[in-house]
């Protein structure tokens, strides 16, 4: 189920690559964030807190990613036209409860000016 399109700028282009921003409420302490391309899982990141507030970050499908207190950024490099697709941030909230899954996304348009290695 798609909960909605992202209510923020999800794609940030730089240097022939794209940063895909997946936001989560900053109150959330433990969660899993997956980046989906169409229906395929491209990347995932899980943040858990153990005893003594020790934070653990795990990735089963690793992508270059960056975690902040309210977002996960996934980075895709060497853009080409095949990257054009619907991308979704699939957030599973574990703590604080209730458990909640949300799917938000948008379409990544690829324009010539954003490609990594343009022929001059």
């Amino acid at each position: 189920e798609i909960n909605g399109s992202a209510n923020y700028e999800m794609f940030i282009f730089h240097n022939g690559g794209v940063q895909i921003l997946c936001k989560y409420p900053d109150i959330v302490q433990q969660f899993k964030m997956q980046l989906l391309k169409g229906g395929q899982i491209l990347c995932d990141l899980t943040k858990t807190k153990g005893s003594g507030n020790t934070v653990s970050i795990k990735s089963l499908k690793f992508c270059h990613s960056q975690l902040s207190n309210n977002s996960v950024s996934f980075f895709l490099y060497n853009l080409d036209h095949s990257h054009a697709n619907y991308y979704f941030c699939n957030l599973s909230i574990f703590d604080p409860p209730p458990f909640k899954v949300t799917l938000t996304g948008g379409y990544l348009h690829i324009y010539e000016s954003q490609l990594c290695c343009q022929l001059k």
Epitope: N3, G4, N7, Y8, K23, P25, D26, I27, V28, Q29, Q30, K49, N70, I93, D95, P96, P97, P98, F99, K100, T102, T104
Partner: antibody, heavy 121, light 106 residues
Framework: QVQLVQSGAEVKKPGSSVKVSCKAS????????MHWVRQAPGQGLEWMGL????????NYNQKFQGRVTITADKSTSTAYMELSSLRSEDTAVYYC??????????????WGQGTTVTVSS | EIVLTQSPATLSLSPGERATLSCSAS?????MHWYQQKPGQAPRLLIY???KLASGIPARFSGSGSGTDYTLTISSLEPEDFAVYYC?????????FGQGTKLEIK
């Protein structure tokens, strides 16, 4: 139906502590976090903090850090908010509120009826 | 701290009229929620995620906005709508409420 029932009104002396309770019913207590919010007379609402019932993780508004302690007793489905070193400006109605999420954010979906705490010498 | 400024502080209208309440944030927030409070009662959730109607809330209530400017609209006021309305942001810690708009009968 989902209900949050709070303890009765309290009158406290400056420098003392107060502990307000919030008993949940109509849902599985550990499946939601609980927030505390206060409202001074004629004033707006102020978020104090929350507790994740199943992990015991707490998150406090820095304004109250060191003075507020939020706890929960799973066996009785009751959340507690204790405020210490009371001063006259802590006179307020204290509310518990259940945590919930939308697609983008979190909010309080169910509230207790409120507990009036009066701090007076 | 993100400061939420609600305007007007008091709004005097008659039943059947349209009410527009504003909430301005001191910096950008991702979403806004709205609560209604009547004297001697706890607040009640009206709108969450900027525009979604909470369970049991009549369709005359609606919310909109983005960034720093958000609006609660009541399309045609009913007698039971006269109350205090608060906006709330949970985007930036510490989480804050507006000071409230009192909607009173003209």
């Amino acid at each position: 139906q989902v209900q949050l029932v709070q303890s009765g009104a309290e009158v406290k002396k400056p420098g003392s502590s107060v502990k307000v309770s919030c008993k949940a019913s109509g849902y599985t207590f550990t499946d939601y976090a609980m927030h505390w919010v206060r409202q001074a007379p004629g004033q707006g609402l102020e978020w104090m903090g929350l507790i994740s019932i199943y992990s015991d993780h707490t998150n406090y508004n820095q304004k109250f850090q060191g003075r507020v302690t939020i706890t929960a007793d799973k066996s009785t489905s009751t959340a507690y908010m204790e405020l210490s070193s009371l001063r006259s400006e802590d006179t307020a109605v204290y509310y518990c509120g259940r945590n919930n999420y939308g697609n983008y954010g979190w909010y309080f979906d169910v509230w207790g009826q409120g507990t009036t705490v009066t701090v007076s010498s | 701290e993100i400061v939420l400024t609600q305007s007007p502080a008091t709004l005097s209208l008659s039943p059947g009229e349209r009410a527009t309440l504003s909430c301005s944030a001191s910096s950008s927030v991702s979403y806004m929620h709205w609560y209604q409070q009547k004297p001697g009662q706890a607040p009640r959730l009206l709108i969450y995620d900027t525009s979604k109607l909470a369970s049991g809330i009549p369709a005359r209530f609606s919310g909109s906005g983005s960034g720093t400017d958000y609006t609660l609209t009541i399309s045609s006021l009913e007698p039971e709508d006269f109350a205090v309305y608060y906006c709330f942001q949970g985007s930036g810690y510490p989480y804050t409420f507006g000071q409230g708009t009192k909607l009173e009968i003209k």
